[in-house]
Amino acid sequence: EDELQVIQPEKSVSVAAGESATLRCAMTSLIPVGPIMWFRGAGAGRELIYNQKEGHFPRVTTVSELTKRNNLDFSISISNITPADAGTYYCVKFRKGSPDDVEFKSGAGTELSVRAKPSAPVVSGPAVRATPEHTVSFTCESHGFSPRDITLKWFKNGNELSDFQTNVDPAGDSVSYSIHSTARVVLTRGDVHSQVICEIAHITLQGDPLRGTANLSEAIRVPPTLEVTQQPMRAENQANVTCQVSNFYPRGLQLTWLENGNVSRTETASTLIENKDGTYNWMSWLLVNTCAHRDDVVLTCQVEHDGQQAVSKSYALEISAHQKEHGSDITHEAALAPTAPLGGSG
């Protein structure tokens, strides 16, 4: 008879993680007597995957009934494949011997590659908020995919971004890979409702990419604009001064009225008017009894927004000679504007 040949017909096999991999092997002869074994890798460090002779291999089943003598098919199936199973598998015929069986002939090997889906991309933004016209960085991470080839794109409100840097690790061969990308985004005043999207395409996703999103509302701070005006009053001994706080984000805002530099009242914005662009407006007013003042009054609206340094706007309230003759206590109260005089985004 011709000398036994070990035939592994497939050079490579690709399997999705979680599926079973069939590794084919056939012998051309039954001689010599002895077991066949499957190994992953070659050389001294090779890993035994299946031994016809002995052992417990719960994930491995033989494709054919090996107890039939005329069987020359020594293919195996490995269940529940993970990326860690990737490698080159060798079907090896041994000759019965002692103290150990003697390797007689090996197949050429079959490379098993495992297609593993990337994890859902996680997008994270900056730790602190930034104001419009500033650049912030967003990161996108995904792990556990194989093979290494992967495509990552960034979008802002559907528009593809170009200012980003992407790394796939490790650089060399591995059972699975990770991707890390950092995108630089210039903020605009209208970005409260904006989203950045990290989109990942991979062979395992069959054309249906994975997306991770982050809201720019978590990254942006739009400082308010202030406008202090005097409203007309019927009673000539009262002045109504309003402070219109416009187009700010996020909500957190504290307003303080000062009369000639002295704190008159502090209040925290509660019921806000939301603009279409996601920013907020708020109005506070101060009723001033002009009779109580002998001289002109400087009224200051001071706003502390989102824990930042206060901004202020002052208004000089002129006291007429007639009003200066009558002395009276100052009265003031705050009220919410029934409408937002300033709408839209700047």
Partner: antibody
Framework: EVQLVESGGGLVQPGGSLRLSCAAS????????MHWVRQAPGKGLEWVSA???????YYTGSVKGRFTISRENAKNSLYLQMNSLRASDTAVYYC????????????WGQGTMVTVSS | DIQMTQSPSSLSASVGDRVTITCRAS??????LAWFQQKPGKAPKSLIY???SLHSGVPSKFSGSGSGTDFTLTISSLQPEDFATYYC?????????FGQGTKLEIK
């Protein structure tokens, strides 16, 4: 059903000859290594001879040159030609099938008695 | 030739007992060791191959272990049908050789 049935045993004088047969059923005999094992009365088991799937033959020292193992694929049968028989060859002779990949004995015939006596 | 030595040659035990028979090879035989059971007037029956693998249909009360030169056959709970003679055999190289047998008798 896988089965081995031996025949051809009997009483023979020292120096005589005998041909044992083993008819296999339920499997193809030529696909297996086949063996003859004997057991002298009141004694243990002794391996006698084997024939491999390639026709290679093996014998224990005491029968070498006197016994010949062979098979006939068309009849799915195994044979043991015994010449120059001695009293020490008296035994029950069993036909045995070797296992699939390691030649471990798995199927035994019921045996046939060979008596060498004058 | 490889010599196979069994011990003990005979053994008396009771139903329900756990018994162990040992077999020693004169040289390393890897794990190409088989065990057979034979009852008077009957052909041997194959129990175990490659030291620890049970042949089809053999009850799990039979177990084998060992590698190299020292091997054991254990019967976990003796039943009346288990009283017989047991043989070990090496089949790593020709000539295949058997142990002299261990006769297991009812006490």
């Amino acid at each position: 059903e896988v089965q081995l049935v031996e025949s051809g045993g009997g009483l023979v004088q020292p120096g005589g000859s005998l041909r044992l047969s083993c008819a296999a059923s339920g499997f193809t005999l030529s696909s297996y290594d086949m063996h003859w094992v004997r057991q002298a009365p009141g004694k243990g088991l002794e391996w006698v001879s084997a024939i491999g799937t390639a026709g290679d033959t093996y014998y224990t020292g005491s029968v070498k040159g006197r016994f010949t193992i062979s098979r006939e694929n068309a009849k799915n049968s195994l044979y043991l030609q015994m010449n120059s028989l001695r009293a020490s060859d008296t035994a029950v002779y069993y036909c045995v099938r070797g296992g699939v990949w390691d030649d471990a004995f798995d199927i035994w015939g019921q045996g046939t008695m060979v008596t060498v006596s004058s | 030739d490889i010599q196979m030595t069994q011990s003990p040659s005979s053994l008396s035990a009771s139903v329900g007992d756990r018994v162990t028979i040992t077999c020693r090879a004169s040289q390393d035989i890897n794990n190409y060791l088989a065990w057979f059971q034979q009852k008077p007037g009957k052909a041997p029956k194959s129990l175990i191959y490659t030291a620890s693998s049970l042949h089809s249909g053999v009850p799990s009360k039979f177990s084998g272990s060992g590698s190299g030169t020292d091997f054991t056959l254990t019967i976990s709970s003796l039943q009346p049908e288990d009283f017989a003679t047991y043989y070990c055999q090496q089949y790593v190289s020709y000539p295949y050789t058997f142990g002299q047998g261990t006769k297991l008798e009812i006490k």
